[in-house]
């Protein structure tokens, strides 16, 4: 695709290129033959990220506590306020628009990936030699008591949701 | 002062191309864009297409995009407006404004017939 | 694209009469509009762009107006001189587009 009749940063308008306003600043009046393009700076709580023909800021985005948000780093005149989840919670979109709490592994699950701001919990089912036998968005799947280093024996078999129970050795009389 | 002088009229064939210049002086050649219209027998105005001498970057009307090319030469401030296989509609005056703040100032227009 | 439409399409109007020239764009063109005045023989004159900056050298009887979709143009005593037709263009989105055009003739 060849060159366009205006360079990078400019714009074409009326049969002439004019300066787009940078990031941060808005467009108040396009440039004529004889004024250069007049930009001024985005207010307090607005955002503009590129560079720009536009005639109004954006709004920085606000993080509703009631839906579970809160601001991860603060919006600037150039950037807008990413917001991330409460403890506890985790976005529901990549625009993290809403929370919702973590997802708690059940029993015979446990949590192979820890929920994030962003992310939620990932359970796996415990494999054989591993259980879980409480709901838990931490835990991870335990492996069942070793009887034999104890010098017990397996009294009954471990499932993925209960430890082997160990007892003693049958004793010889 | 500004002055824009296109190349004389031309008789083409259907299927033909035809380049038309428009010699620019004035001004600093580089520092305003050309615009180039054309204006059918008693119709209006319609636009083609617009360079940037300072670059060669240009932006064109889709009704002509792939036959219309526009270029310019800052060596003889000249700007060129061809347009290829030629049919009978093509018939009109052509001509190339300077622009800046609306086409400020036109060529003369030229003159081109497309007849077998 | 945007659709220019301009009327009325012929204004027959006296000497030292006004005359008023309408154009009508087919959505908001910011008032990036132009006004051009061709006679036969000439080259095209740019009167007014930007809806109301009159060109150097365009004599004071010429002033345009409007916004969003209306714009006018208006000759406030029509000169011998004035006796031509008039395109209003748009300059405000690509491919730029003209009105038809308004003959303004001696009445």
């Known amino acids: 695709e060849p060159p366009t009749a205006c360079r990078e940063k400019q714009y074409l308008i009326n049969s002439q290129c004019c300066s787009l306003c940078q990031p941060g600043q808005k467009l108040v009046s396009d440039c004529t033959e004889f004024t250069e393009t007049e930009c001024l700076p985005c207010g307090e709580s607005e955002f503009l990220d590129t560079w720009n023909r536009e005639t109004h800021c954006h709004q920085h985005k606000y993080c509703d506590p009631n839906l579970g948000l809160r601001v991860q780093q603060k919006g600037t005149s150039e950037t807008d306020t990413i917001c991330t989840c409460e403890e506890g919670w985790h976005c529901t979109s990549e625009a993290c628009e809403s929370c919702v709490l973590h997802r708690s592994c059940s029993p015979g699950f446990g949590v192979k990936q820890i929920a994030t701001g962003v992310s939620d919990t990932i359970c796996e089912p415990c494999p054989v030699g591993f259980f879980s036998n409480v709901s838990s968005a931490f835990e991870k799947c335990h492996p069942w008591t070793s009887c034999e280093t104890k010098d017990l024996v397996v009294q009954q078999a471990g499932t993925n949701k209960t430890d082997v129970v160990c007892g003693p050795q049958d004793r010889l009389r | 002062q500004v002055q824009l002088v296109q190349s004389g009229a031309e008789v083409k064939k259907p299927g033909s191309s035809v380049k038309v210049s428009c010699k620019a002086s004035g001004y600093g050649f580089t520092n305003y864009l050309i615009e180039w219209v054309r204006q059918a027998p008693g119709q209006g105005l319609e636009w083609i297409g617009v360079?940037?001498?300072?670059?060669?970057?240009?932006n064109y009307n889709e009704k002509f995009k792939g036959r219309a090319t526009l270029t310019a030469d800052k060596s003889t401030s000249t700007a060129y407006m061809e347009l290829s296989s030629l049919r009978s509609e093509d018939t009109a005056v052509y001509f190339c404004a300077r622009g800046g703040s609306g086409f400020a100032f036109w060529g003369q227009g030229t003159l081109v017939t497309v007849s077998s | 694209e945007i659709v220019m439409t301009q009327s009325p399409a012929t204004l027959s109007v006296s000497p030292g009469e006004r005359a008023t020239l309408s154009c009508r764009a087919s959505?908001?063109?910011?008032?990036?509009l132009n006004w051009y005045q061709q006679k036969p023989g000439q080259a095209v004159r740019l009167l007014i762009s930007?809806?109301?900056r009159l060109h150097s050298g365009i004599p004071a009887r010429f002033s345009g107006s409007g916004s969003g979709t209306e714009y006018t143009l208006t000759i406030s005593s029509l000169q011998s001189e004035d006796f031509a037709v008039y395109f209003c263009?748009?300059?405000?989105?690509?491919?730029?587009?003209f009105g038809q055009g308004t003959k303004v003739e001696i009445k």
């Open positions: 959505q908001d063109i910011s008032n990036h």
């Open positions: 930007s809806t109301s």
């Open positions: 360079i940037n001498p300072g670059y060669g970057g240009v």
């Open positions: 263009q748009q300059g405000n989105t690509l491919p730029w587009t």
